[in-house]
Interface confidence: low
C-alpha cells in the first residue's frame, strides 16, 4: 500500500474535511518543482517568486540578479534566454500558442553590458522560434517559415532559406504531424556544439491533404482553420536535412545531408539529429512502416564542403515483433571518443536496455539487463553514466536514478535515489550541469514532491531547492484518499493497477467503481506519483473507488506486453480493463451495479469500446475527445501501431476497430460523449461520426461540445467539463447532490 508519507494526521477527526470540486478546479493543492537553468558546471539561473532572474553559484554560495523584474515588466516578458557569452538576454513576450509545443512570440534583446535594449536591426514579429548559438551570441530564428541568422544581436540578419510558405514549406520548424508525433518540439534546427554549423529540417507539405474546421470566434462568419494533416494512409510530408556553415553562410550555402539508400527506397521519416562534434553529426531515419530505423553518422568533408555519410557508419535497428523503439526511437548519447555511443533498445529477452555501440549494432555490449527497463540516459561523462529505470523492488511505475561507473572495469552500478526518501520519493527525474559536476533531483511522489541539489561526484545532497511546505500545511486538515499500487496475474499477463480508496474505506462495504483509462501504446498510468486531482475528489468526497489499470500495450514492462497490441489496437487494451474490473468485483467491496469508465483521447476510445463490449459490466461511461476510427488519426502515430489502411495490409482491422461499428452495443449503457470543436489533434469528426452512428442505430446518449476548444479543453471549459462529468457520474451512481 502506498500511503501519502507526508500527510500529518490530526487526532481530531472533525477538523478534517474532504476535498471539494472547487479545490480541484482552483488548483488549491498544486505542487511546485525546481529545475535549475544550468549555465555552467556550477552555475544556474532561476526566476525568483518576484520575477527577478537570479544567477546562483553553487561553489561560492553567492547569488546575484542579472535581470530585474522591472526590465522584464517593461516588455511584459514571460520568458528569457541568456546568451552563452553572458552579454545578452532575449526576452519573450506576446506568447501566442499554436499547437502542443509551438507558439509565436515577440523577442527583445537586452544588452547586459550597458543595461539597454539593443536598438537597430530589431527582430521581426511574431517569431516562430529563436535560439542562441551554444557559444558566443549568434542568433538563429524562424520567421514566416524561413530561417535567419545574426552574427551579433545588433547585426542585420542573413536569410538562410527563401522557400518558406505557410502550410506548404516549413524551414527550421516542424509541420503539424512532425511536431506532435515525431520530434515533440517546436523547433527543427540544431546548432553544432561550438556554433560553427547550423543544421535544419525542411518539411514540404505541398501534397498533404488538409483538415479544415470552423473556428466560430465572435465575428459574423466563422473562420476556417486549415492544417496539412496526413491521416492514416495519406500522403506524408517530404523531409530534407540541410547544414550551413554559420561563419561564412554565403560561401557555399546550405548543404543537404544524404539519406541512407535503404531508407530512401520508399516513404520515410527523419526522426532526430544529434551533433557529435562540430564536424560530425548523427541523423536518425525511419521507414514509413516503422519497424526499421537507421542511425547514420556523417562527417564534414573540408575539401568538398559537403557532408559524407559512409555506409560503414550506418547502424540499423529493426523490430521483428512490433515497431522500432518505444513511443519514439531512442536517441544516442555519444561518448568522448566521438564515435561510440550508448543507446536504449530491446535486448534478446525483449526488455529495453542500455547498449554500448562501438562498431556495429550486432556487436553491441549490453550495459544493463534484467526483467525491467532502462528508461532514459541522462548524461555520460568520462567515468559515469547516469540513467533512470524501474528496476528497484520490481515496481514498473517507479523511476530511480542510477550511476554506472564506466571508467572502471567491471563497471559498477549504484542507485543514487533508491534510499534517499524511500517512502516519500519513488519517482524521480534529474537535471545535470556541465560535466555532471552537480545535478538536481526532482521527486514527483508518491509523497509531496521535493526538488534537491546534489554533488555530481559524491551524490551528497547540498540543499533543498523546493519542498512544497505550503502544500504540506494546506493538506494537514484534508481527508485525502488512500492509494494502493498492486498487481493482478491473469493468464500469464501482469496487470498493474492503482486503486484510489475513500478515506474511511471499509472492505466490508460496497462502493461504486470508476475506471480511469488511457491505455495508449507505450503509455503508463500506474505511476508512483503525487496528485490531488478530480479522481482524488471523487474518492474523498463522493466515496467512489477509482482504479487505473495498465494492460497490454502499455510501457516499461517488456516487449511482450508492449507489442501485444501491434496491428490490432482496440482489442487487448479493452479486454484487460474488463478483466481487471471482474477481478475488482471478486475483491468483494465493489457494487457490481455501479461501475463506470472514463477516458480522454486514446482513453476515450478505450472507454467507448469497453462500454460497447456487451459485457454488461458498466452502467455508464464518459469519452472525452475520443478517437473513433484509426482512419481519422495522424499517419505517423497510427501507422506505427496499425500498419496501413490498405486491403493488402491492415484495412480489415482498421474497419473492425471503430467505435461506430459497435453503435448497437451502447443501448444498455449511459454514454456521455464530449469533444472540443477546434481540436487540431483528434478532430471533432471522430465524435461527429460516433454521434451519427448512435442516432442511426436509434441509441440514446448524452453529449457536450466545447466551442472553439482544442484537445486540452482548457480555461473555463475545464471547470465546465469536470462539473458536467461530476453530475453525470453522481446521477449514474445515484449519489445525492
Amino acid at each position: 500500500i502506498v500511503l501519502r508519507p507526508s500527510r500529518v494526521h490530526n487526532s481530531e477527526e472533525n477538523t478534517m474535511r474532504a476535498l471539494t470540486l472547487k479545490d480541484i478546479l482552483n488548483g488549491t493543492f498544486s505542487y511546485k518543482t525546481f529545475f535549475p537553468n544550468w549555465i555552467s558546471g556550477q552555475e544556474y539561473l532561476h526566476q525568483s517568486a518576484d520575477n527577478n532572474i537570479v544567477l546562483y553559484n553553487i561553489e561560492t554560495g553567492q547569488s546575484y540578479t542579472i535581470l530585474s523584474n522591472r526590465t522584464m515588466k517593461s516588455v511584459n516578458a514571460s520568458n528569457y534566454g541568456l546568451s552563452p557569452d553572458r552579454q545578452f538576454v532575449y526576452l519573450e513576450s506576446d506568447y501566442s500558442k499554436l499547437w502542443r509545443y509551438s507558439y509565436t512570440a515577440t523577442y527583445y534583446i537586452y544588452d547586459l553590458s550597458n543595461g539597454e535594449f539593443v536598438r537597430g536591426n530589431e527582430l521581426p514579429r511574431p517569431i516562430q522560434y529563436l535560439c542562441w548559438s551554444p557559444v558566443g551570441s549568434k542568433l538563429a530564428y524562424v520567421y514566416q517559415n524561413n530561417i535567419y541568422l545574426k552574427q551579433r544581436p545588433g547585426d542585420p540578419p542573413f536569410q538562410i532559406t527563401f522557400n518558406g510558405r505557410e502550410n506548404k514549406i516549413f524551414n527550421g520548424i516542424p509541420d503539424w504531424v512532425y511536431e506532435e508525433e515525431m520530434l515533440a518540439t517546436k523547433y527543427a534546427l540544431w546548432w553544432s556544439p561550438n556554433g560553427k554549423f547550423l543544421a535544419y529540417a525542411e518539411f514540404n507539405d505541398t501534397d498533404i491533404p488538409v483538415i479544415a474546421y470552423s473556428y466560430y470566434g465572435d465575428e459574423q462568419y466563422p473562420r476556417t482553420i486549415n492544417i496539412p494533416y496526413p491521416k492514416a494512409g495519406a500522403k506524408n510530408p517530404v523531409v530534407r536535412i540541410f547544414i550551413i556553415d554559420t561563419t561564412y553562410p554565403a560561401y557555399v550555402g546550405p548543404q543537404e545531408v544524404p539519406v541512407p539508400a535503404m531508407i530512401a527506397s520508399s516513404d520515410y521519416y527523419f526522426s532526430w539529429l544529434t551533433w557529435v562534434t562540430d564536424e560530425r553529426v548523427c541523423l536518425q531515419w525511419l521507414k514509413r512502416v516503422q519497424n526499421v530505423s537507421v542511425l547514420s553518422i556523417c562527417d564534414f568533408r573540408e575539401d568538398w564542403q559537403t557532408w559524407d555519410c559512409p555506409k560503414t557508419q550506418e547502424h540499423i535497428e529493426e523490430s521483428r515483433t512490433g515497431w522500432a523503439g518505444g513511443f519514439f526511437v531512442s536517441t544516442p548519447v555519444f561518448s568522448y571518443d566521438a564515435i561510440s555511443y550508448y543507446k536504449i533498445f530491446s535486448d534478446k529477452d525483449g526488455y529495453k536496455h542500455i547498449h554500448y555501440i562501438k562498431d556495429t549494432v550486432e556487436n553491441a555490449i549490453q550495459i544493463t539487463s534484467g526483467k525491467w527497463e532502462a528508461i532514459n540516459i541522462f548524461r555520460v561523462t568520462q567515468d559515469s553514466l547516469f540513467y533512470s529505470s524501474n528496476e528497484f523492488e520490481e515496481y514498473p511505475g517507479r523511476r530511480n536514478i542510477y550511476r554506472i561507473s564506466i571508467g572502471s572495469y567491471p563497471p559498477s552500478k549504484k542507485c543514487v535515489t533508491c534510499h534517499l526518501r524511500k517512502e516519500r520519493c519513488q519517482y524521480y527525474t534529474a537535471s545535470f550541469s556541465d560535466y555532471a559536476k552537480y545535478y538536481a533531483l526532482v521527486c514527483y511522489g508518491p509523497g509531496i514532491p521535493i526538488s534537491t541539489l546534489h554533488d555530481g561526484r559524491t551524490d551528497q545532497e547540498i540543499k533543498i531547492l523546493e519542498e512544497n511546505k505550503e502544500l504540506e500545511n494546506a493538506l494537514k486538515n484534508i481527508q485525502l484518499p488512500k492509494e494502493e499500487i498492486k498487481k493482478l496475474e491473469v493468464d500469464e499477463i501482469t496487470l498493474w493497477y492503482k486503486m484510489i480508496l475513500p478515506p474511511q474505506f471499509d472492505r466490508s462495504k460496497k462502493y461504486p467503481l470508476l475506471i480511469q483509462v488511457y491505455g495508449g501504446p507505450c503509455s503508463q498510468s500506474v505511476r508512483s506519483v503525487f496528485a490531488v486531482n478530480w479522481i482524488s475528489y471523487l474518492a474523498s468526497k463522493e466515496g467512489m473507488v477509482i482504479a487505473l489499470v495498465d494492460g497490454r500495450g502499455t510501457a516499461f514492462q517488456g516487449d511482450k506486453l508492449l507489442y501485444a497490441v501491434y496491428r490490432k489496437l482496440g482489442v487487448y487494451e479493452v479486454e484487460d480493463q474488463i478483466t481487471a474490473v471482474r477481478k475488482f468485483i471478486e475483491m468483494g467491496f465493489i457494487d457490481e451495479k455501479r461501475i463506470a469508465i472514463w477516458g480522454w483521447s486514446y482513453g476515450g476510445y478505450v472507454s467507448s469500446l469497453a462500454l460497447a463490449s456487451g459485457t454488461g459490466l458498466f452502467k455508464c461511461g464518459i469519452a472525452v475527445a475520443p478517437v473513433s476510427s484509426w482512419e481519422y488519426y495522424a499517419s505517423v502515430y497510427t501507422e506505427r501501431f496499425m500498419g496501413l489502411p490498405t486491403k493488402d495490409d491492415n484495412l480489415e482491422h482498421y474497419k473492425n476497430s471503430t467505435v461506430m461499428a459497435r453503435a448497437e452495443y451502447f443501448r444498455n449503457v449511459d454514454y456521455l460523449l464530449i469533444h472540443g470543436t477546434a481540436d487540431d489533434n483528434v478532430h471533432f469528426q471522430n465524435s461527429a461520426q460516433i454521434a451519427k452512428a448512435l442516432v442511426n442505430a436509434q441509441v440514446d446518449f448524452q453529449a457536450m461540445w466545447y466551442s472553439d476548444q482544442n484537445h486540452g479543453l482548457s480555461g473555463l471549459s475545464t471547470n465546465h467539463l469536470y462539473t458536467h462529468m461530476t453530475h453525470f457520474l453522481k446521477q449514474c451512481f445515484s449519489l445525492s447532490d
Epitope: 479486454e575 482491422h653 476497430s657
Partner: nanobody, 122 residues
C-alpha cells in the same frame, strides 16, 4: 436469430488428429471455437473472419487450423498432434462484429452452438 450446428469431435489417442465443423444459419462476420474443460473457464481456441483473418490461442498455434467456407457459412477446425490437455467440450461461436475474433472472453460473443465433446486419451 442465428443458429449454429456443430458436428465432429469424439475420442482420439494422444498425438492423433480430429476435426470439428460448424454451420451457421445466416451469414456472419466472425466465427470461432471455444473450449471448456471440467471446472475451467470457457477459453478461445481459434477464430476467423469472413475475410479469412485468423486468431489462435498460443496453446494451439501450429497444431490447430481454422478455416471457413463463406458460401456454406461453415467454419472448420482441424486439430493435429492432440494432447490430453486438449480434452474439453468444444463450442462453436459466432458474432456479427469482425473485431470479435480477438475477444477471448466468451461473454463477448453473441451466438453459440450446443457443444461437442473432444476426448484425448493418453
Amino acid at each position: 436469430q442465428v443458429q449454429l450446428q456443430e458436428s465432429g469431435g469424439g475420442l482420439v489417442q494422444a498425438g492423433g488428429s480430429l476435426s470439428v465443423s460448424c454451420a451457421a444459419s445466416g451469414s456472419i462476420f466472425s466465427m470461432g471455437w471455444f473450449r471448456q474443460a471440467p471446472g475451467k473457464q470457457r477459453e478461445l481456441v481459434a477464430a476467423v473472419t469472413s475475410g479469412g483473418v485468423t486468431n489462435y490461442a498460443d496453446s494451439v498455434k501450429g497444431r490447430f487450423t481454422i478455416s471457413r467456407d463463406n458460401a456454406k457459412n461453415t467454419v472448420y477446425l482441424q486439430m493435429k498432434s492432440l494432447k490430453p490437455e486438449d480434452t474439453a467440450v468444444y463450442y462453436c461461436a459466432a458474432d456479427s462484429s469482425r473485431g470479435k475474433i480477438y475477444f477471448s472472453n466468451y461473454r463477448s460473443w453473441n451466438y453459440w452452438g450446443q457443444g461437442t465433446q473432444v476426448t484425448v486419451s493418453s
